[in-house]
Interface confidence: low
Amino acid sequence: LQDLCSNCPAGTFCDNNRSQICSPCPPNSFSSAGGQRTCDICRQCKGVFKTRKECSSTSNAECDCISGYHCLGAECSMCEQDCKQGQELTKKGCKDCCFGTFNDQKRGICRPWTNCSLDGKSVLVNGTKERDVVCGPSPADLSPGASSATPPAPAREPGHSPQ
């Protein structure tokens, strides 16, 4: 009898009520492997989720998050609110990065600026809430003429307002 069930392909289940005939999965259910005794209920992408891939008889639905949210967890089991660059999500919502830290993404936490001096380098471009510092050559690497020159103003991306 077990051999009969093993012949049931994905998209079907081995129906004990019908002499172990392979029956198609009912609507809104699937079996992704052969030899299944039941079909699994399809995931519904509702609420904060939107459908990325519809459920079929052989594979579960796949969900994505609505605009303003991003996926968390295995198979996008949760959606987390986006923040702006230069912010992190806290218990009280999106908060600006503290001075000396930055976040260049809509998710994750603020991270400390790189400490250029640890690598024997100097700060070429100052950090912002959205961007890490850019390290340049160490003062010793600069030629005597260049070392006494006025350091360059921090570079800014087009459309980027000063902090």
Partner: nanobody
Framework: EVQLVESGGGLVKPGGSLRLSCAAS????????MSWFRQAPGKGLEWVSH????????DYADSVKGRFTISRDNAKNSLYLQMNSLRAEDTAVYHC???????????????WGQGTLVTVSS
């Protein structure tokens, strides 16, 4: 099992008011941030507001700020949305949602109510 049941929707004229309620059961209500979302006909889901478990932290979408007020009564396991100065563009199905206890803005797909329809029309 987590259950969220919204009520209070209906037909209202522009400029009018409605108060939505969400009755929660099956979890420690006061431990969780709660949210209101809405879905206008043919549109995507839009976050409206959320409130922390104690009610001390509240935030609103810009589109409803100054017109809508979120509140909760933990003794009654209930969430509310007072909607004033309603506009035609507020027409939508309103859903309450339980956010993840670790972080506001994080919602899993099981913890949603079926919604209550608000229609703003003259």
């Amino acid at each position: 099992e987590v259950q969220l049941v919204e009520s209070g929707g209906g037909l209202v004229k522009p400029g009018g008011s409605l108060r939505l309620s969400c009755a929660a059961s099956g979890f420690a209500f006061s431990d969780y941030y709660m949210s209101w979302f809405r879905q206008a006909p043919g549109k995507g889901l839009e976050w409206v507001s959320h409130i922390s478990g104690s009610g001390t932290t509240i935030d609103y979408a810009d589109s409803v700020k100054g017109r809508f007020t979120i509140s909760r009564d933990n003794a009654k396991n209930s969430l509310y949305l007072q909607m004033n100065s309603l506009r035609a563009e507020d027409t939508a199905v309103y859903h309450c949602a339980r956010e993840d206890s670790r972080m506001p803005g994080t919602t899993d797909f099981d913890n949603w109510g079926q919604g209550t329809l608000v229609t703003v029309s003259s």
